[in-house]
Amino acid sequence: QPDAINAPVTCCYNFTNRKISVQRLASYRRITSSKCPKEAVIFKTIVAKEICADPKQKWVQDSMDHLDKQTQTPKT
């Protein structure tokens, strides 16, 4: 079993300064660890490139909304 206590933490130290088209994005994950200096989003593109982005920016929030809705599979 992996040792979760000593698992490496991924952090973002710089954010992209260009808006990425949602058509290029495949997924995202949030960096919420208190061990990281910045609250961040890591987008994964359709060519598997990972890009750090600032969750305070509206285009980042809109892109997360877009990707969330793509996962929508009603189970109710």
Partner: nanobody, 123 residues
């Protein structure tokens, strides 16, 4: 960290209304998808409603669709659940949650949870 505090629960008669509020503090509220879930005694926690970061998209469980309305005010860091035409089967503890990871209605994609507020609907 995001701290979530629910309020507005209580005892109401069947057919009545309640408005739940969830006040968030901590990190950037507008960067989180917000959801409401509920848990009745002896039952598993179930999804109720979700609203996107922009507030432009919402989704409801079939059991509350047409009766409940989720909304948010990003300026006030608050999400609401307006509950109308309440039924005894709506009795539960209602939880507000902030979704950090990619998803929609799945509880596992919500990183932050409030302590819950009790809603009791009497017949």
């Amino acid at each position: 960290e995001v701290q979530l505090v629910e309020s507005g629960g209580g005892l109401v008669q069947a057919g009545g209304s309640l408005r739940l509020s969830c006040a968030a503090s901590g990190r950037t509220f507008s960067s989180y998808r917000m959801g409401w879930f509920r848990q009745a005694p002896e039952k598993e926690r179930e999804f109720v409603a979700v609203i996107s970061r922009s507030g432009g998209s919402t989704f409801y469980s079939n059991s509350v669709k047409g009766r409940f309305t989720i909304s948010r005010d990003n300026a006030k860091n608050t999400v609401y659940l307006q509950m109308n035409s309440l039924k005894p089967e709506d009795t539960a503890v209602y939880y507000c949650a902030a979704g950090a990871q990619m998803g929609w209605a799945e509880a596992s994609t919500y990183d932050y949870w409030g302590q819950g507020t009790q809603v009791t609907v009497s017949s």
